[in-house]
């Protein structure tokens, strides 16, 4: 079955290379068990930033490496992304599933632009 | 519970034809994108080529010409055409469906497509060779 996966359409990250967003799904179930991943999609290229499957009413957990931090608020899920540079602009698109109890629903969000300017550095002072 | 039931592979000689099905059911939302994926022993799935809601088709270059998608919504099923086959054909196709129309059409040019897709079949082999 499909749902509906609302997100931002542009996010500017910040000059600390952070960027966030809130990607919200119309669920039509009571689900309990839910897994969002991140995609990025640049030159003809789709790649998994992150991926993190949490329990309904608890924390999302990713990966201790992870360049992704998030939390859930009903079916609101608040994404960070850190670490970012200029290299990495591009479409990251938020996809969510409801894995329990069945059925087995699936959205995929148009995708929030991300633009990350990486800093001037700073001049030098004599 | 949505299922997706492809048929139709085969052993076919270089420049044979074949027909691919799949049936769906159990899926209810009307815009969607429906695909056909391939992979081949070692590699990494890819796009074939897709057909929107709508029946808007795009193909993968290594097929254009050769390789035709259609549905019938009538009987919810999927085909594939594949003309003129050669041994680089050679793989397990699936047939799968995408929730979101927006990356419908560049997915058979685009690199890791498969994410946008959720549901898939089990696969039918198909084997060119002589």
């Known amino acids: 079955k499909a749902m509906h996966v609302a997100q931002p359409a542009v996010v500017l990250a910040s000059s600390r290379g952070i960027a966030s967003f809130v990607c919200e799904y119309a669920s039509p179930g009571k689900a309990t068990e839910v897994r969002v991943t991140v995609l990025r999609q640049a030159d003809s290229q789709v790649t998994e930033v992150c991926a993190a499957t949490y329990m309904m009413g608890n924390e999302l957990t990713f990966l201790d490496d992870s360049i992704c931090t998030g939390t859930s608020s009903g079916n609101q899920v608040n994404l960070t992304i850190q670490g970012l540079r200029a290299m990495d602009t591009g479409l990251y698109i938020c996809k969510v599933e409801l894995m329990y109890p069945p059925p087995y629903y699936l959205g995929i969000g148009n995708g929030t632009q991300i633009y990350v300017i990486d800093p001037e550095p700073c001049p030098d002072s004599d | 519970e949505v299922q997706l039931v492809e048929s139709g592979g085969g052993l076919v000689q270089p420049g044979g034809s074949l027909r691919l099905s799949c049936a769906a059911s159990?899926?209810?939302?009307?815009?969607?994108?429906l695909g056909w994926f391939r992979q081949a022993p070692g590699k990494g799935r890819e796009a074939v080529s897709t057909?929107?809601?709508?029946?808007?088709?795009s193909y993968a270059d290594s097929v254009k010409g050769r390789f035709t998608i259609s549905r019938d919504n009538a009987k919810n099923t999927l085909y594939l055409q594949m003309n003129s086959l050669r041994p680089e054909d050679t793989a397990v196709y699936y047939c799968?469906?995408?929730?979101?129309?927006?990356?419908?059409?560049?997915?058979?040019?685009?690199?890791?497509?498969?994410?946008?897709?959720?549901?898939w079949g089990q696969g039918t082999l198909v084997t060119v060779s002589s």
């Open positions: 799968a469906i995408g929730p979101n129309p927006r990356y419908c059409s560049g997915a058979p040019s685009t690199r890791g497509a498969e994410h946008y897709f959720g549901y």
């Open positions: 159990g899926y209810t939302y009307s815009r969607h994108c």
């Open positions: 057909i929107s809601s709508g029946g808007s088709t």
